[in-house]
């Protein structure tokens, strides 16, 4: 399928022209420009960068570029009253204090406004007490502590290692366990790859490096004070007591040097098994409290951060479509960073910048896309996806009627091993076809396609000869578009070898050491992986905006629906007696999936055969494809999570980063054996099966012949 059929273009203006215009050297230059000073959300520096990007996008040739501002709740440390944690002796004297700031990297000693490590939205407080080590603070870790080890976290300060799950879930779990404070730390087992030096000599985390991050449990709400609606000039704001998702106990992050000082004194229970041991030179005792000689010592937190309503700025650029200007393909990524943002987000923002430049170059030569392309530089992603969510809330009516697709563009790299793609099943074939046309940047795959190197290095667990494509979870700006609005979404980046590198994310994530030099020296000196990611993201946008028939294959949804139905059924079948007792049947769901499969197959046949020269029929078929994702939206949302409305996918209730399939049923079944009222619990399972079956059937019917 060619993409050069859009109006007013010469044959040279096709996908190849767009891709050929993308240059690694430009991405490198843009990354350098975006990373010389911090661009924390809500600061003057980030406002200035917004205006710079607005100006440059205009120069590149976009039709319009506007700033969209909102006044949202952000969180900052107190500049004169720093946050830290102490070990105190029986007299209350501080005998050890954790760091007040990270040791600055070489060349950045004199940079001002480096925000010290903090957990954004932590309440103020100075709790003191005994420590309990809770491993990763996952749901299963607290089950192990409370149910198996009979350790009570109530009134304790818990210390948890970063990794495996979103930090906000850790804090929520700690709160539910009754903890009065949370210390988060980066263990070398998760953030120090063997055989690699720490920064500035390599890409590993030094002992003084600390991961910043928000600890909200927003569940898609956006600004905590204006859930569901934009935080505009006339917004009604909730009181702080009614704000969505704020933690109720003080939280603070530390590095592994400081963690060693706390953990080396731990007494109490030994770790339950080896999975609770990290790589520090400590016993990983669970506690509570310190061992014999140190048993009178306590841990004290000193947290003085403040929550403040602050103005943020999105940059929204428009390249008007020539044929279907009322159909929007969106490419968006955030601009705000915790410090320099060498990887997160500026490796993504630099790629977006080059994609805009390439599209602009084509436009200046007389080309236009078939559909409108919107480009977004989001603000305050690090504070809870606030910029993207507020903009989507403000424009929800337009988006739900006109939104074709959203492609996310945060960090372009989290490693340099192979491609990683998470997307709606509708985009599987698009991604496969595109990557077959792109050259692999990988060593040993010269002259081979990206598809080939990706499939070799990251094979699909289900289909031989195909690459792994993962479910969308959350923790990034696609959330509101996909989970709330039901707009087909996807993301792509270069990643590490998950088999050999078992650390979580990349070691320097959200630390002061995430610099331009980190990328240029250690990850991608030639910027060839950045260029490949630009080709993938840009190529997807090009096809989505320019192909006559939308490049969505509804049959791929049918395949995964069957897989997800099988999976949730097998989970339920772990309780055969209860299923029999409460007459739990999945027949309706399997029937709906079967119907969806048959209808999707027939739709695909019609898609091959219809008269593409008939604009009405073309538009009709494209609308059925566009609105298929929308059909999976339940207007009532998931239980207790009204802004997660997608019935097939939602962020896991136990890890915001991970996607869960049939989340309503999954959550109803989770830990069901511990529910006090089994009849009520299994009743909810049945209700969720009903909702899922209805939704799949209803979605199938949107693909039926219209009359």
């Amino acid at each position: 399928k060619s993409s050069n059929e859009a109006t007013n273009i010469t044959p040279k203006h096709n996908m190849k022209a767009f891709l050929d215009e993308l240059k690694a050297e430009n991405i490198k230059k843009f990354l350098y420009n975006f990373t010389q000073i911090p661009h924390l959300a809500g600061t003057e520096q980030n406002f200035q960068l917004a205006k710079q990007i607005q100006s440059q996008w205009k120069e590149f040739g976009l039709d319009s570029v506007e700033l969209a501002h909102y006044d949202v709740l952000l969180s900052y440390p107190n500049k004169t009253h720093p946050n830290y944690i102490s070990i105190i002796n029986e007299d209350g004297n501080e005998i050890f204090n954790t760091s007040l700031f990270e040791p600055p990297p070489p060349g950045y000693e004199n940079v001002s406004d480096i925000v010290p490590p903090f957990s954004a939205f932590s309440p103020q407080g100075m709790p003191e007490g005994d420590l309990v080590y809770v491993n990763y603070a996952r749901t299963e870790d607290f089950f192990k502590l409370e149910r198996d080890m009979k350790i009570n976290c109530s009134g304790k300060i818990v210390i948890a290692r970063y990794g495996k799950v979103f930090r906000g879930n850790k804090v929520k779990n700690a709160q539910l366990a009754g903890a009065k404070g949370v210390i988060l730390y980066s263990d070398p087992a998760d953030y120090f790859a063997p055989g690699v030096k720490s920064y500035p000599d390599g890409w590993n985390l030094p002992g003084g490096g600390v991961q910043r991050g928000n600890i909200l449990n927003l569940n898609g709400a956006g600004d905590p004070l204006t859930p569901g609606y934009p935080a505009n000039e006339y917004a009604y704001r909730r009181g702080i007591a009614e704000a969505v998702g704020l933690p109720s106990i003080p939280v603070h992050p530390i590095g592994y040097y400081d963690a060693q000082k706390l953990l080396e004194k731990m007494g109490g229970s030994a770790p339950p098994d080896s999975s609770w041991r990290g790589s520090l030179k400590v016993p990983y005792n669970v506690g509570p409290g310190f061992t014999g000689n140190f048993s009178t010592q306590k841990v004290k937190m000193h947290i003085h951060s403040t929550n403040e309503v602050t103005r943020i700025y999105n940059v929204i650029g428009t390249l008007r479509g020539a044929v279907e200007p009322d159909r929007y393909v969106i490419l968006g990524g955030h601009r705000d960073s915790w410090v320099f943002g060498g990887i997160d987000p500026q490796s993504g923002a630099a790629v977006v910048h080059e994609i805009v430049r390439s599209f602009g170059t084509l436009k200046k030569e007389g080309w236009r896309p078939r559909r409108t392309i919107l480009f977004a530089s989001w603000d305050a992603e690090e504070f809870g996806l606030l910029g993207s969510t507020e903009w989507a809330e403000e424009n929800s009516r337009l988006l739900q009627e006109r939104g074709v697709a959203y492609i996310n563009a945060d960090s372009s790299i989290e490693g340099n091993y192979t491609l990683r793609v998470d997307c709606t099943p509708l985009m599987y074939s698009l991604v496969h076809n595109l990557t077959k046309e792109l050259k692999s940047p990988d060593e040993g795959f010269e002259g081979k396609s990206l598809y080939e190197s990706w499939t070799k290095k990251s094979p699909s667990p289900e289909f031989s000869g195909m690459p792994r494509i993962s479910k969308l979870g959350s923790g990034n700006d696609f959330e509101v578009f996909f989970q709330r609005l039901g707009i087909a979404s996807g993301r792509a980046r270069y990643t590490k070898n998950w088999e050999t590198n078992k650390f979580s994310g990349y070691p320097l994530y959200h630390s002061v050491y995430e610099t331009y030099e980190l990328v240029e020296k250690f990850y991608d000196p030639m910027f060839k992986y950045h260029l490949t990611v630009a080709q993938v993201r840009g190529g997807m946008v090009f096809e989505l905006a320019n192909s006559i028939v939308l490049p969505f294959d509804c049959r791929d949804y049918a395949v995964v629906l069957r897989k997800y139905a099988d999976k949730i059924y097998s989970i339920s079948m772990k309780h055969p007696q209860e299923m029999k007792t409460y007459s739990v049947s999945f027949d309706s769901l399997f029937s709906a999936v079967k119907n969806f499969t048959e209808i999707a197959s027939k739709f695909s046949e019609r898609l091959q055969d219809f008269d593409k020269s008939n604009p009405i029929v073309l538009r009709m078929m494209n609308d059925q494809l566009m609105f298929l994702e929308r059909a999976f939206i339940d207007p009532l949302g998931l239980p207790d999570r009204p802004f997660y409305r997608h019935v097939i996918y939602a962020p896991s209730s136990h890890n915001k980063y991970a996607g869960e399939s049939f989340p309503g049923i999954y959550d109803a079944l989770f830990d069901i054996e511990s529910k006090v009222d089994p009849s009520k619990a299994w009743g909810e399972v049945k209700r969720q099966i009903y909702v899922a079956a209805f939704t799949v059937q209803a979605a199938a019917e949107t693909l039926s012949e219209v009359a």
């Epitope: 204090n97 040791p103 002992g207």
Partner: antibody, heavy 120, light 108 residues
Framework: QVQLVESGGGVVQPGRSLRLSCAAS????????MNWVRQAPGKGLEWVAI????????YYADSVKGRFTISRDISKNTLYLQMNSLRAEDTAVYYC?????????????WGQGTTVTVSS | SYELMQPPSVSVSPGQTARITCSGD??????AYWYQQKPGQAPVLVIY???ERPSGIPVRFSGSSSGTTVTLTITGVQAEDEADYYC??????????FGTGTKVTVLG
């Protein structure tokens, strides 16, 4: 290049005070913990004091606690050791040594030392 | 106060292996560091974090740790390795301590 240069040593009477300085150059002073280590004539190394890069912690050997004070001036890239109530047993070569802040890289750069003699 | 014990001296022929031990109760929870000091000179770091070698230090120097003992091994000793060697570690109160020191003599 990376360099530490101590100064301020000399001969002093017991009970008197002395201030040692250590001028740092060629590296990011604000990223390094700084130590004082001494060596009495013909004896082994004795750690004296440490100040963390962010000044969050200062620790002293029991033998000098209450008498010596470690400090630093980031603007001058200089480390200090204020030594009060000096004793004969404080006679030693005093070295300053850096270690990367909150890390496990050890004291990787040392000065050449300055000699303190406490004698009546 | 906390002590790190080393043998006062070790003698070794050129090309042979020298092993210097350092014992202390806190070593299972604390990293050890090794320094070489030649007469009239400042100490030089030769091993950090129990077993890591700084750049510029010959590969014949290695470190290991087991329980309350750490060991510095010099494989294929050379004449220029004759020096005093000190281990160093920390205790749980945040203070540092040096070992008693070991004089390595290269025979012949």
């Amino acid at each position: 290049q990376v360099q530490l240069v101590e100064s301020g040593g000399g001969v002093v009477q017991p009970g008197r005070s002395l201030r040692l300085s250590c001028a740092a150059s060629g590296f990011t002073f604000s990223s390094y913990n700084m130590n004082w280590v001494r060596q009495a004539p013909g004896k082994g190394l004795e750690w004296v004091a440490i100040i963390y890069y962010d000044e969050s912690n200062k620790y002293y050997a029991d033998s000098v606690k209450g008498r010596f004070t470690i400090s630093r001036d980031i603007s001058k890239n200089t480390l200090y050791l204020q030594m009060n109530s000096l004793r004969a047993e404080d006679t030693a070569v005093y070295y300053c040594a850096r270690e990367r802040g909150r890390d496990y890289y050890g004291m990787d750069v040392w000065g050449q030392g300055t000699t303190v003699t406490v004698s009546s | 106060s906390y002590e790190l014990m080393q043998p006062p001296s070790v003698s070794v022929s050129p090309g042979q292996t020298a092993r210097i031990t350092c014992s202390g109760d806190a070593l299972p929870k604390q990293y050890a560091y090794w320094y070489q000091q030649k007469p009239g000179q400042a100490p030089v770091l030769v091993i950090y974090k129990d077993s890591e070698r700084p750049s510029g230090i010959p590969v014949r120097f290695s470190g290991s740790s087991s329980g309350t003992t750490v060991t510095l091994t010099i494989t294929g000793v050379q004449a220029e390795d004759e020096a005093d060697y000190y281990c160093q570690s920390a205790d749980s109160s945040g203070t540092y301590v040096f070992g008693t020191g070991t004089k390595v003599t290269v025979l012949g």
